[in-house]
């Protein structure tokens, strides 16, 4: 059910493209294609190419993205396009000028002097933005989200975007300055991963990050399963970067026991993050037989 045909506006197309990209990434990383048939991988890549081509129709002259061409471009959506295209670049041919043009726009047009990224064109399909939907601590969570996207595009775009390292550092400094006052576990998790990517998740931030976990296995807000899966996935990625392998198993088990395999309304971020995190776990941690993800993928019929 994760391999779907992308369609619709600039937001809906990304909603449709997300699960296919992350499914292929997950199955590549965990070497599980033989379960589904290697020919299915090629079919999935065709769907990713289709999604990529369709998304280009929503690229504005500035290289930013919006749901429709007559709407103001969205910081969040553009960062998300950067994130998905960066991952897809390992799977299909992605024009680096397209990807790095979006990166440049984020830095030059949307980053304030204090490092914060601002949103002037909010996403219409609010269900796709995950835990960021809760307006509390939005400056930090958006800045962390963009910073993570920039880090993921760094290998491809560093040569084309001179201001990329400086932009990342500025955003990181803002997150550092705000981190100890954060209250939402979601923000603590996403911002923690952003800091970990910069090798800055150390004391006192590390203590705050770890102590925010409930029962040392999840970053949780009441009655928000999708946000909690997303937040805990960010936290798992941070723990893996920290090589804190002692803390990882209960987090992985919690994610696994949510029996959350993606798909469904409002699932875009949770789907992307849980499979990115579990793929990273299976790459970083040898002998990971304790993870028994019963994943099923269905290709759309033609």
């Amino acid at each position: 059910h994760l391999i779907v045909t992308p369609a619709g506006c600039g937001e809906q197309n990304m909603i449709g493209m997300t699960p296919t990209v992350i499914a292929v990434h997950y199955l590549d990383q965990t070497e599980q294609w033989e379960k589904f048939g290697i020919e299915k991988r090629q079919e999935a890549l065709e769907l990713i190419k289709k999604g990529y081509t369709q998304q280009l129709a929503f690229k504005q002259p500035s290289s930013a993205y919006a749901a429709f061409n007559n709407r103001p471009p969205s910081t969040w959506l553009t960062a998300y396009v950067v994130k998905v295209f960066s991952l897809a670049a390992n799977l299909i041919a992605i024009d680096s000028h397209v990807l790095c043009g979006a990166v440049k726009w984020l830095i030059l047009e949307k980053q304030k002097p204090d490092g914060v990224f601002q949103e002037d064109g909010p996403v219409i399909h609010q269900e796709m933005i995950g835990g960021f939907r809760n307006a509390k601590e939005a400056d930090v969570s958006l800045t962390a989200f963009v910073l993570i996207a920039l880090q993921e595009a760094r290998d491809i775009c560093e040569g084309q975007v001179n201001s990329l390292p400086g932009s990342i550092n500025k955003a990181g400094e803002y997150i550092e300055a705000s981190y100890m006052n954060l209250q939402r576990p979601y923000t603590v998790a996403i911002a923690g991963y952003a800091l970990a990517l910069m090798n800055k998740l150390e004391e006192p931030y590390l203590g705050k990050f770890l102590n925010t976990a409930k029962d040392r296995n999840r970053w949780e807000e009441p009655d928000q399963q999708l946000y909690n899966v997303e937040a805990t996935s960010y936290a798992l990625l941070a723990l893996l970067l920290l090589k804190d392998f002692d803390s990882v198993p209960p987090v992985v088990r919690w994610l696994n026991e949510q029996r959350y395999y993606g798909g469904g309304y409002g699932s875009t971020q949770a789907t992307f993050m849980v499979f990115q995190a579990l793929a990273q776990y299976q790459t970083d941690v040898p002998d990971h037989k304790d993870l028994n993800m019963d994943v099923s993928f269905h290709l759309p019929s033609r």
Partner: antibody, heavy 120, light 108 residues
Framework: QSLEESGGRLVTPGTPLTLTCTVS????????MAWVRQAPGKGLEYIGW??????TYYASWAKGRFTISKTSSTTVDLKMTSLTTEDTATYFC????????????????WGPGTLVTVSS | DGVMTQTPSSTSAAVGGTVTIKCQAS??????LSWYQQKPGQPPKLLIY???KLASGVPSRFKGSRSGTEYTLAISGVQREDAATYYC??????????FGAGTNVEIK
Amino acid sequence: QSLEESGGRLVTPGTPLTLTCTVSGFSLSRYTMAWVRQAPGKGLEYIGWIDSSGSTYYASWAKGRFTISKTSSTTVDLKMTSLTTEDTATYFCASGNDGGDPLYYGMDPWGPGTLVTVSS
Amino acid sequence: DGVMTQTPSSTSAAVGGTVTIKCQASQSIRSWLSWYQQKPGQPPKLLIYEASKLASGVPSRFKGSRSGTEYTLAISGVQREDAATYYCLGSIASDDTAFGAGTNVEIK
């Protein structure tokens, strides 16, 4: 930190019974709690645990007949139905070590246990 | 249940000697293993968690180790107060978790 089980008594087969674990010195809003039993002269048997948010996890054999629930910030109940003589045991509650998953971080401390006898 | 096979069922050692208890997991459980000590009429006491980490207040003569799916509790320089029954607890998943059958340790 201390724990104490209560509610153990002699019951007839088929009777439901609820045991209570009362904690002092800490709040269950931040701690996990597990239940374990021990038949007379036998080994320990894991039943299940409850996390600080109230989500429950059971051993496969205990699913359906045993229910763990948090009744306040200091009490956790173990509800047992369709009791048989095989359920005769001392029932222990134990907190997750350091407030974590008790199956990973271990169970510490433990209560002294309460004896349940099922007999006709 | 078959998750954990604990050996031996009983053993004895002289004061100052060494006791070794093993638990074999039916499949990989990584570090999901803890060790407990129980004396007659008392609740169990946590000794080791995460396969090899010493619980707070536990003497350093207790040592947990892992090799693949085999887990070992070693007590070196055994003391009289170490006479007890020892149990491992292994977890494949939350619903597939069990204690070993126990090892009775007698001090001569």
